[in-house]
């Protein structure tokens, strides 16, 4: 029975091999089945100590939940066992395998992946709620500047059609709980808050339920207060780049500013062999600055096309507002094209990185 994306019905006590790292396996089990998830070490090498996690929480072994380094067994599965499972390296917390498990009301009827009959796949069989796009449910932290609009979504399905409700910090959340109210769009499974303020910070949980079970997802909202400070530039951006002659390069600069920022991209140049003027100010040329039709988002990216050796050097993202300026710099190294490198090698030259 084809159930769409990487999703299959698995018979009782059937063992599911782990997906390749980075790939999310979506699985459907029947009520009462034994869920067996297998996560072999990537590349067949040693795995080291691992932990199994469900919906972000470490699984505690019990008589019903049997945890091994490469295998997880959940006996006599019920709706409450639906959720997002992952196997992680204990030390690094690196995710080795992802599984989205849905336990339906009816016991499953064996592994019938090859069947072409799609009549079964109408989504109308009775069952507990499940996320319709589970791979989209992994953005759990949202940080936005004050006065922005925030939207949380939890698209789900089930039969009967589940209801959705929202909690803030574990308590029922209603429009009267905030100035400006909230917009609940049940059909779109969304909660919208316009013009957020610091008091909107907290954990927002969607609870999706029907008579067969419930699922929930918690998002953490951080509201960045508007305070009089110069622009903040994201650490590590722009990043140093190495490019081959003739290729395209992009530098990125993330600017956070309450007061309207003015963003410029500068390239450091030499004048009469000197990089700085008599007063110690670097010589620069402005490559990109705000125009009538440029947005802040567009100014956060500097694109260089078909780079030449002359493009090598230091680039600076300069952001200013009414309070002050901030800047971050990065270097571009331009390497010869591969054919030139080969010719140079044959001539006995060595290129140091």
């Amino acid at each position: 029975e084809s159930l769409g994306t990487e999703q299959r019905v698995v018979g009782r006590a059937a063992e599911v091999p782990g997906p390749e790292p980075g790939q999310q396996e979506q699985l459907v089990f029947g009520s009462g089945d034994a869920v067996e998830l297998s996560c072999p070490p990537p590349g067949g090498g040693p795995m080291g100590p691992t932990v199994w996690v469900k919906d972000g929480t470490g699984l505690v072994p019990s008589e019903r939940v049997l945890v091994g380094p490469q295998r997880l067994q959940v006996l006599n599965a019920s709706h409450e066992d639906s959720g997002a499972y992952s196997c992680r390296q204990r030390l690094t917390q690196r995710v080795l395998c992802h599984f989205s498990v849905r336990v339906t009301d009816a016991p499953s009827s064996g592994d019938d992946e090859d069947g072409e009959d799609e009549a079964e796949d109408t989504g109308v069989d009775t069952g507990a709620p499940y996320w319709t796009r589970p791979e989209r449910m992994d953005k759990k932290l949202l940080a936005v500047p004050a006065a922005n609009t925030v939207r949380f979504r939890c698209p789900a399905a089930g039969n009967p059609t589940p209801s959705i409700s929202w909690l803030k910090n574990g308590r029922e959340f209603r429009g009267e709980h905030r100035i400006g109210g909230i917009k609940l769009r049940h059909q779109q499974w969304s909660l919208v808050m316009e013009s957020v303020v610091p008091s909107d910070r907290g954990n927002y949980t969607c609870v999706v339920e029907n008579k067969f079970g419930s699922i929930r997802q918690t998002y953490t909202l951080d509201v960045l207060e508007r305070s009089p400070h110069r622009p903040i530039l994201q650490a590590g951006l722009p990043a140093n780049q190495t490019a081959v002659l003739g290729s395209d390069v992009e530098f990125h600069c993330k600017v956070y500013s309450d007061a309207q920022p003015h963003i410029q991209w500068l390239k450091h140049v030499e004048v009469n062999g000197s990089k700085v003027g008599p007063d110690g100010t670097p010589y620069v040329t402005v490559l990109k600055t705000a125009g009538a039709n440029t947005t802040d988002k567009e100014l956060e990216v500097l694109s260089l096309h078909n780079v030449t050796f002359e493009d090598a050097g230091e680039y600076t993202c300069l952001a200013g507002n009414s309070i002050g300026f901030s800047h971050h710099s990065a270097w571009l190294v331009v390497l010869p094209a591969e054919e030139e490198l080969v010719e140079a090698d044959e001539a006995g030259s060595v290129y140091a990185g």
Epitope: G4, T5, P21, G22, Q23, Q24, Q26, V95, H98, T122, G123, V124, T132, R133, P134, E135, R136, D138, K139, R153, P155, A157, T161, Q187, Q188, W189, H252, K254, K297, E298, E300, V301, S303
Partner: antibody, heavy 118, light 107 residues
Framework: EVQLQQSGPDLVKPGASVKISCKAS????????MNWVKQSHGKSLEWIGD????????TYNQKFKDKATLTVDKSSSTAYMELRSLTSEDSAVYYC???????????WGQGTTLTVSS | DIVMTQSHKFMSTSVGDRVSITCKAS??????VAWYQQKPGQSPQLLIY???TRHTGVPDRFTGSGSGTDYILTIRSVQAEDLALYYC?????????FGAGTKLELK
């Protein structure tokens, strides 16, 4: 300006593999998912799968599970789709398209025409 | 998989007319429907998502409506540049699926 620049047309022999690239520019690549879509000549659109550039997590349409492999190189803001064991049925235009969370494909690449022929 | 059915393969219209393109899902997609326009030799372009939200820069003559399994894209006053292929897509549940398309042409 947001742009998704795809690699050029390709003519390959049956049984071979091909890797199509999609270079994103004008936005931060990790803010959006990257989807891939197939359009056979004169036909509708088929969703192949998507990749989260933040962590490389992929989701595939079952139909393309054994055909396509999606990867991303964050450092070059480039997404890739490798198609293997090619047959004439795989001849089509392939698009990359970005999506923010659950909100439809707001920008598309120009398409890469793949022809499989001996 | 959810099947999206566009019952009209072709629709004839005149400039200035009001036209409605329909799309039916094989099951409730909870307003998770997008509409795309595709002109010959070009990539599809997003018009509407979540059934009724107009994408940035899309003229307000395009409106989307519907719920459950039935969805409509309406073009209030058709312009010559609107003659194209229109696809519906459900973006509610994976695998995402598209309709077969409706070609809008001149009478």
């Amino acid at each position: 300006e947001v742009q998704l620049q795809q690699s050029g047309p390709d003519l390959v022999k049956p049984g071979a593999s091909v890797k199509i690239s999609c270079k994103a520019s004008g936005y931060t690549v990790t803010d959006y998912y990257m989807n891939w879509v197939k359009q056979s000549h004169g036909k509708s659109l088929e969703w192949i799968g998507d990749i989260n550039p933040n962590n490389g997590v992929t989701t595939y349409n079952q139909k393309f599970k054994d055909k396509a492999t999606l990867t991303v190189d964050k450092s070059s803001s480039t997404a890739y789709m490798e198609l293997r064991s090619l047959t004439s049925e795989d001849s089509a235009v392939y698009y990359c398209a970005r999506e923010e969370d659950f909100d439809g494909f707001d920008y598309w690449g120009q398409g890469t025409t793949l022809t499989v022929s001996s | 998989d959810i099947v999206m059915t566009q019952s009209h393969k072709f629709m004839s219209t005149s400039v200035g007319d009001r036209v409605s393109i329909t799309c039916k899902a094989s099951q409730d997609v909870s307003t998770g429907v997008a509409w795309y326009q595709q002109k010959p030799g070009q990539s599809p372009q997003l018009l509407i998502y979540w059934a009724s939200t107009r994408h940035t820069g899309v003229p307000d003559r395009f409106t989307g409506s519907g719920s459950g399994t039935d969805y409509i894209l309406t073009i209030r006053s058709v312009q010559a540049e609107d003659l194209a292929l229109y696809y519906c897509q459900q973006h509610y549940s994976t695998p995402l699926t598209f309709g077969a398309g409706t070609k809008l042409e001149l009478k």
